[in-house]
Interface confidence: low
């Protein structure tokens, strides 16, 4: 087996081609780095499964508003 | 158990083609993307220089777009990775590696995703 990589940076080369239900979604993180071939969105689902997903796509950023609004509104 | 045997590796003059081959057993394509990677003599290991999903998707790396093509053969379990206008510095070690996409197979995995290597097949380009 090849030396692990010691790159720290994570980059996306494809984009998911499905829409994610909101209610799989945990959490996301912007992929911004220069590094990276792609600007990209990458959801961690409840199953902790990382998607990498297109920021342009307007369900994307709906997803997005959604999990900032969860992260902001305290569950009682 | 998944496995990935390559093949196809030799000693080509720069300018030639060769043609790798990755034979997977243990788990079909269906829900997996296989990528290929390079390590040269002493150097951090490259890659994915290109990525084929069970989607159709592709991905090729700046450095092989162009000269490298991935396809598969979905009846036979292989990847292939034909390589033409092959340069001195292509000269690595060629791993092929595969993960599965999950349970939603939405979207191609992250370059650290992949879990199952095969044993390399070596790669030399004379000048």
């Known amino acids: 087996q090849p030396d692990a990589i010691n790159a720290p940076v994570t980059c996306c080369y494809n984009f998911t081609n499905r829409k994610i239900s909101v209610q799989r979604l945990a959490s996301y993180r912007r992929i911004t780095s220069s590094k990276c071939p792609k600007e990209a969105v990458i959801f961690k689902t409840i199953v902790a499964k990382e998607i990498c997903a297109d920021p342009k796509q307007k369900w994307v950023q709906d997803s997005m508003d959604h999990l900032d609004k969860q992260t902001q509104t305290p569950k009682t | 158990e998944v496995q990935l045997v390559e093949s196809g590796g030799g000693l080509v003059q720069a300018g030639g083609s060769l043609r790798l081959s990755c034979a997977a057993s243990g788990f079909t394509f269906d829900d997996y993307a296989i990528g290929w990677f390079r390590q040269a003599p002493g150097k951090e290991r490259e890659g994915p220089l290109c990525?084929?999903?069970?989607?159709?998707?592709?991905y090729y790396a700046d450095s092989v777009k162009g000269r490298f093509t991935i396809s598969s053969d979905n009846a036979k379990n292989t990847v292939y990775l034909q390589m033409n206008s092959l340069k001195p510095e292509d000269t690595a070690v060629y791993y092929c590696a595969a993960e599965s996409l999950g349970d939603y197979g939405l979207a191609s995995p992250l370059p650290a995703d992949f879990g199952s290597w095969g044993q390399g097949t070596q790669v030399t380009v004379s000048s």
């Open positions: 990525i084929s999903s069970s989607d159709g998707s592709t």
